[in-house]
Amino acid sequence: YDFTNCDFEKIKAAYLSTISKDLITYMSGTKSTEFNNTVSCSNRPHCLTEIQSLTFNPTAGCASLAKEMFAMKTKAALAIWCPGYSETQINATQAMKKRRAAKVTTNKCLEQVSQLQGLWRRFNRPLLKQQ
């Protein structure tokens, strides 16, 4: 999916008002210095591509993020403010229902959510030069 035509300001507002808080809740009890940010993004569409991938694609050691509250809210924001995104999710939703992975917070998941926090922060500061 190409995130170029999303309403970035409305997605940013949703992140600042609610998604960011859910990410913090998920990471509670973890030191902010515990994980290094290894995933980066260069502009807003690229950031959303990386955010979608890390949030919804199961990875080795972390298969369950899609059921978390921040993930549900991310999915809603993309469906509402990214033209045509919802139709790409029809089949994905069916597949996710079949998988039904249990919610398990592993260290790998915490690391992944830490990366997500970094990607979202970068999404909110699109004019900053890449380090």
């Epitope: 409305k10 999915k75 809603a76 509402i80 403010w81 033209p83 029809i90």
Partner: antibody, heavy 120, light 107 residues
Framework: QVQLVQSGAEVKKPGASVKVSCKAS????????MHWVRQAPGQGLEWMGT????????DYNQNFKGRVTMTTDTSTSTAYMELRSLRSDDTAVYYC?????????????WGQGTLVTVSS | EIVLTQSPGTLSLSPGERATLSCRAS??????VHWYQQKPGQAPRLLIK???QSISGIPDRFSGSGSGTDFTLTISRLEPEDFAVYYC?????????FGQGTKVEIK
């Protein structure tokens, strides 16, 4: 089963405001956005806007910007649509309709409609 | 804003006949089109979602097709209860919009 029950008909004077309610039951309220669609007598359907409880935010049709406010009360699973500075051409049936925001993505259940008449 | 244009405005047919309703979008919207039926004094009822996907409880004489800019709702054999107004809607991008409607009336 899923039900959306709207408040009763209203008669208002030009310049006044109206607040229509829509009580939902039979599903998880926060899994769906609540959209508002109106239909003037003998006319087609016009999307007014939506409130998304999951994100606690709204998005409105520019045609109504500044005149409309959509809210929800999640404790009672009720959505509200307030339209201000009413004009005679706001006379219409106002519908609420739910739409999934993490699945479904379509207006699959509608309220029965609320007739708002604006007349001096 | 995406404009949906429905044709014809009115379709006069007899029970048992086939009805073909058209909906054209002002720009490509992939398959983000849904079809609704509305009878006098009633709320719209969802018939088809995402251009061609059937809805539970809707008779299989209703079918949809199309993608991009051109979409079609087909009623294979009209029943007396099918005479109503039909609307297409796009949810590709905000603001969501509806076509102006096609009235299917008894000939």
């Amino acid at each position: 089963q899923v039900q959306l029950v709207q408040s009763g008909a209203e008669v208002k004077k030009p310049g006044a405001s109206v607040k229509v309610s829509c009580k939902a039951s039979g599903y998880i309220f926060t899994d769906y956005a609540m959209h508002w669609v109106r239909q003037a007598p003998g006319q087609g359907l016009e999307w007014m806007g939506t409130f998304i409880p999951l994100l606690d935010t709204s998005d409105y049709n520019q045609n109504f910007k500044g005149r409309v406010t959509m809210t929800t009360d999640t404790s009672t699973s009720t959505a509200y649509m307030e339209l201000r500075s009413l004009r005679s051409d706001d006379t219409a049936v106002y519908y609420c309709a739910r739409m999934g925001v993490t699945h479904s993505y379509v207006m699959d259940a509608w309220g029965q409609g609320t007739l708002v008449t604006v007349s001096s | 804003e995406i404009v949906l244009t429905q044709s014809p405005g009115t379709l006069s047919l007899s029970p048992g006949e086939r009805a073909t309703l058209s909906c054209r979008a002002s720009q490509p919207i992939s398959i983000s089109v849904h079809w609704y039926q509305q009878k006098p004094g009633q709320a719209p009822r969802l018939l088809i979602k995402f251009a061609s996907q059937s809805i539970s409880g809707i008779p299989d004489r209703f079918s949809g097709s199309g993608s991009g800019t051109d979409f079609t709702l087909t009623i294979s054999r009209l029943e007396p209860e099918d005479f109503a107004v039909y609307y297409c809607q796009q949810t590709f991008s905000l603001p969501y919009t509806f076509g102006q409607g096609t009235k299917v009336e008894i000939k």
